[in-house]
């Protein structure tokens, strides 16, 4: 009955997510059969997070709303390795909103999940950010510098990247 109660718990947890994510892709974590980590299908996974590339073009505020409806946020990039993983799924001729903004226009950049902004772990293109009116960040490709960040007006529709914690069942 330990296995039975574990299954019941899993089912109720899955029901929680069903509203937004009718299908999950789960993998066994480690050697313990009881620990599964899941991402919504067709999200991709890296370390403890799931990622979704939204190809609809929307403003930053709408993009963040769109992610939150799915139980996620616009992506917060914490490491170079994470960015390297993310860019594998991006198109070079597109730009994608990040969960990074400067609402006050004072160059106090902030992440949507309140992760402290660390100047040492930023990947701005050279010369960026360059406009106080451009209060939202995108990631895009420049032939001279490959992938990096740029500040743009928040109201310019772009594609976006959503990120959520993996679902453990």
């Amino acid at each position: 009955n330990f296995m039975y109660s574990k299954t019941v718990k899993r089912l109720s947890k899955l029901r929680e997510y069903q509203q937004y994510h009718p299908s999950l892709t789960c993998v066994m974590e480690g050697k313990d059969i009881e620990d599964w980590s899941c991402c919504p299908t067709p999200w991709t996974s890296f370390q403890s997070s799931c990622y979704f590339i939204s190809t609809g073009m929307q403003s930053w505020t709408k993009s963040q709303k769109n992610c939150s409806v799915m139980g996620a946020d616009l992506v917060v990039i914490n490491t170079r390795e994470e960015q390297d993983f993310i860019i594998q799924n991006l198109k070079r001729n597109s730009s994608y909103f990040l969960g990074l903004s400067d609402p006050g226009g004072r160059r106090h950049w902030q992440w949507v999940d309140q992760t402290p902004y660390n100047e040492n772990v930023t990947f701005w293109h050279s010369g960026e950010p360059n406009n106080l009116d451009e209060r939202c960040a995108i990631i895009n490709f420049r032939s001279s510098e490959e992938w990096g960040w740029n500040d743009i007006h928040c109201h310019v529709p772009q594609k976006s990247i959503c990120k959520m914690k993996k679902i453990y069942i």
Epitope: T61, K65, N131, E134, H155, P157
Partner: antibody
């Protein structure tokens, strides 16, 4: 006093070109995103183009994309709108307007008096 | 594009009474409690003039008889009490997503 003064309007034939200018004074021009907005003879307002303060990022609606080019000279405190392949439906009063940003929202807080463009054969 | 529908297209209000103008967006234009809707007044031969920004904030120098309200896709401009000098055309404008769009305008006549 914050001021925007447009010039360069006039009568032009369909298919022709025209360059509008907007002289700004009383504020740090390079710090502001600037727009051109037009008003049709039926009094409808339509945004035409905007340009960021530095770096020259430009944006246009589909109706003018490829025909109109917005530019600025921050040293001269001047905004420009180069219009080509003009059509009769481009006939309007053209206003230069300043964007003001506050958090994620923005608005046009300063407008020029406008310059009239008439496209007719 | 976000379409803004203003109503009525014109209205006549007696001096001292209330004028109410509605602006409906084809989709929500707010975020985090802020409505991305602005209101402008235009008198003949003049450019538009900012009255209200972010749905309910009065631009400096604008009389307190002007007020804005609303959220989501429904916004309202109120003028009370209406004065002679308020005869003009009023426009709403959304700044949530490009392209920025304007309502068709409401012409206010003072009776």
């Amino acid at each position: 006093e914050v001021k925007l003064v447009e010039s360069g309007g006039g009568l032009v034939k369909p298919g022709g070109s025209l360059k509008l200018s907007c002289a700004a004074s009383g504020f740090t021009f390079s710090s502001y995103t600037m727009s051109w907005v037009r008003q049709t003879p039926e009094k409808r307002l339509e945004w035409v183009a905007y340009i960021s303060g530095v770096g020259g990022d430009t944006y246009y609606p589909d109706s003018v994309k490829g025909r109109f080019t917005i530019s600025r000279d921050n040293a001269r405190n001047t905004l420009y709108l180069q219009m080509s392949s003009l059509r009769s439906e481009d006939t309007a009063m053209f206003y230069c307007a300043r964007h003001h940003y506050s958090h994620y929202f923005w608005y046009f807080d300063v407008w020029g008096a406008g310059t009239t463009v008439t496209v007719s054969s | 594009d976000i379409v803004l529908t203003q109503s009525p297209a014109s209205l006549a209000v007696s001096l001292g009474q209330r004028a109410t103008i509605s602006c409906k967006a084809s989709q929500s234009v707010d975020y985090d409690g802020d409505g991305f809707m602005n209101w402008y007044q235009q008198k003949p031969g003049q450019p538009p003039k900012l009255l209200i920004y972010a749905a309910s904030n009065l631009e400096s120098g604008i009389p307190a008889r002007f007020s804005g309200s609303g959220s989501g896709a429904d916004f309202t401009l109120n003028i009370h009490p209406v004065e002679e000098e308020d005869a003009a055309t009023y426009y709403c404008q959304q700044s949530n997503e490009d392209p920025p769009t304007f309502g068709g305008g409401t012409k206010l006549e003072i009776k």
